[in-house]
């Protein structure tokens, strides 16, 4: 990994004690100042592995509310607009991390989760499994 | 919002100033128990989208290392393997938040942080505009 | 906002060549493509010719390949379609379009007519 030096002027927060913990300023920044209006507000409509977006609320957890994808079809919509099953939709996952509330009910002390999200699918050719 | 009962056993880190700051358990909870090895491993290859990884590497973010998806195509892939300029590869997009050290260089100090990750790519019909 | 001017269509005799323009401005995408689409009475629209902006790959209809030729000039932000041998199959309204990823921006066409 990359050392970094230590900023003299950093709070004196470290604690030997494992697990470790850190202080975070909730005040979040938006780095997205680029970010394009069209950019994929209604591709869930518009793909050929079209999928619907299912609202996820935890009190205990930050974000509390995280959307989830999950496609429409087993198949992906073909020219014609019909269903073809010689394709599969498949839902793009990616890991995110979440602030959850430990010990809970907590305002002000959270531990980093590890969570899976469905953000959207996509069409694949599916891969034939010979069985006996 | 949902108001949650405050745990009479949480740490007094209240602080009254805003921006708010709180404490936060680095050894991070994998929720992730259930996930299927074969999830989404290799759909970048097999999608009529197909998209490329880039590693994002910042020393100053937890995490420091994200993959940013980029298409491989304008158009998507037909049936015959070749391009088709009828449809287009689209990225889609998700908000995740990263923990920015701050001050720099600090190891115990941190800003949530927004920022826009490309997870994969889908199949879409463009939307056509009509110019002057 | 993208803009699309085109010229070069005309009236021409079969065999004969005709050179389609087209200058787009505003585009701000790195990844796009330009092209031709032409639609003749009665018929759908088609995706005639296209060359990918990052890469100058070219794409063609069955219906033009060995005939037309499309390139672009970058420095002048002109996209051209140079159209040989030309039959009375290739009349039609001729479209230029700029494409960018979910997007395709059309302008209002130039007609291309073809007499025997």
């Known amino acids: 990994g990359i050392t970094i030096p230590r900023n003299p002027g950093c709070p004196n927060s470290e604690d030997k004690n494992f697990p470790r913990t850190v202080m975070v300023n909730l005040n979040i920044h938006n780095r997205n100042t680029n970010t394009n209006p069209k950019r994929s507000s209604d591709y869930y409509n518009r793909s050929t592995s079209p999928w619907n977006l299912h609202r996820n609320e935890d009190p205990e957890r930050y974000p509390s509310v995280i959307w989830e994808a999950k496609c429409r079809h087993l198949g992906c919509i073909n020219a014609d607009g019909n269903v073809d099953y010689h394709m599969n939709s498949v839902p793009i996952q990616q890991e995110i991390l979440v602030l959850r509330r430990e010990p809970p009910h907590c305002p002000n002390s959270f531990r980093l989760e590890k969570i899976l999200v469905s953000v959207g699918c996509t069409c694949v050719t599916p891969i034939v499994h010979h069985v006996a | 919002g949902i108001t949650i009962p405050r745990n009479p056993g949480c740490p007094n880190s209240e602080d009254k100033n805003f921006p708010r700051t709180v404490m936060v358990n680095l050894n991070i909870h994998n929720r992730n128990t259930n996930t299927n090895p074969k999830r989404s491993s290799d759909y970048y290859n097999r999608s009529t989208s197909p998209w490329n990884l880039h590693r994002n590497e910042d020393p100053e973010r937890y995490p420091s290392v994200i993959w940013e998806a980029k298409c491989r195509h304008l158009g998507c892939i037909n049936a015959d393997g070749n391009v088709d300029y009828h449809m287009n590869s689209v990225p889609i997009q998700q908000e995740i938040l990263v923990l920015r050290r701050e001050p720099p260089h600090c190891p115990n100090s941190f800003r949530l942080e927004k920022i826009l990750v490309s997870v994969g790519c889908t199949c879409v019909t463009p939307i056509v505009h009509h110019v002057a | 906002q993208v803009q699309l001017v085109e010229s070069g269509g005309g009236l021409v005799k079969a065999g004969g060549s005709l050179r389609l323009s087209c200058v787009v401005s505003g585009h701000t995408s790195e990844i796009s493509a330009m092209g031709w689409y032409r639609q003749a009475p009665g018929k759908q629209r088609e995706l005639v010719a296209l060359i990918t902006s990052r890469s100058g790959d070219t794409h063609y209809s069955d219906s033009v390949k060995g005939r037309f030729s499309i390139s672009r000039d970058n420095a002048k932000n002109t996209m051209y379609l140079q159209m040989n041998s030309l039959n009375p199959d290739d009349t039609a309204v001729y479209y230029c379009?700029?494409?960018?990823?979910?997007?395709?921006?059309m302008a209002q066409g130039t007609q291309v007519t073809v007499s025997s």
């Open positions: 379009v700029h494409n960018e990823p979910g997007h395709l921006y």
